[in-house]
Amino acid sequence: EVEKTACPSGKKAPEIDESLIFYKKWELEACVDAALLATQMDRVNAIPFTYEQLDVLKHKLDELYPQGYPESVIQHLGYLFLKMSPEDIRKWNVTSLETLKALLEVNKGHEMSPQVATLIDRFVKGRGQLDKDTLDTLTAFYPGYLCSLSPEELSSVPPSSIWAVRPQDLDTCDPRQLDVLYPKARLAFQNMNGSEYFVKIQSFLGGAPTEDLKALSQQNVSMDLATFMKLRTDAVLPLTVAEVQKLLGPHVEGLKAEERHRPVRDWILRQRQDDLDTLGLGLQG
């Protein structure tokens, strides 16, 4: 509709304000200056634009910044972020943690969208590694974030960042991921004393080798059964009955309830019956 392309007299927007919600789409296109919009992006969030109107505002920004938005605009996108495609986001260079937080806030409480996944990927690649502050932020918004990374991606996590990891952040990690994270955790916590060290390392033990489990068995750690059940089968098999007894302490009685499940089942089959009998649990090898 060519006749609608010129801004009607008196409708040119001097600023981004609530009056614009009454503009039709073509009026927004014709009467809102893209540069003005870019400088007043922080106001858009507070104005109840429809999604159709947000489409027009996005289009204006796309025309102004065909190579991708500057960070000064990205930081104030707010709900307009929901209109961005992963392709749009790949053009961005986001370096500020504050910008990342502002955009994650828009998505807060919901599963990670493709947009958010792309944003995080761009941000982490831009930083070169997953530093502690970034990891802190990401796991606060998405507790499962760490376990969504491939072992290759996890290899870029510096040991110092491991301090930001909470036990629940590892709930959905598989053994391949824990294989990568465990040595980093071991390095990060190496200067802690026995009991404190065990508290910190416990959630990473799914990646621990046999020799480390043997060492822990000498430290009266009293590992619970839930942790024991997450250990690598190949790491548990070489342990002796005496070592497992020391590792579990008072929790050793829990082996009976788990005797049909790995790694307990496989470990029992590797032991001499005489040794198993010393536990007094009725375990049959």
Partner: nanobody, 119 residues
Amino acid sequence: QLQLVESGGGLVQPGGSLRLSCAASGSVNSITAMGWYRQGPGNERELVAVITDRGRASYADSVKGRFAISMDNDKHTVYLQMDSLKPEDTAVYYCNAHRRTWPHPGDYWGQGTQVTVSS
């Protein structure tokens, strides 16, 4: 998803009043604004009034001083009190809600309720 159901439309004489209601159900969390639009015969759909989840209301010039929008956050319901109605207010009135988070961001619309102002 989010469902919107309008009620309260009808036939009224010029100068009379009507109160429209719109009840939201389903994914009512994250509604950031609700509003009323109308579409008269042969016209485009136009915004009449909108209210944000923080209670800020805005009105089209043509209804200022005559219409009042309000929201009951607990009941997830928005109302439009229409006084001093004129024949030019005749239209189908549509309720609208903005939901501004994943997994279903977007504008949600009701089916519309007919308002006819005629003597």
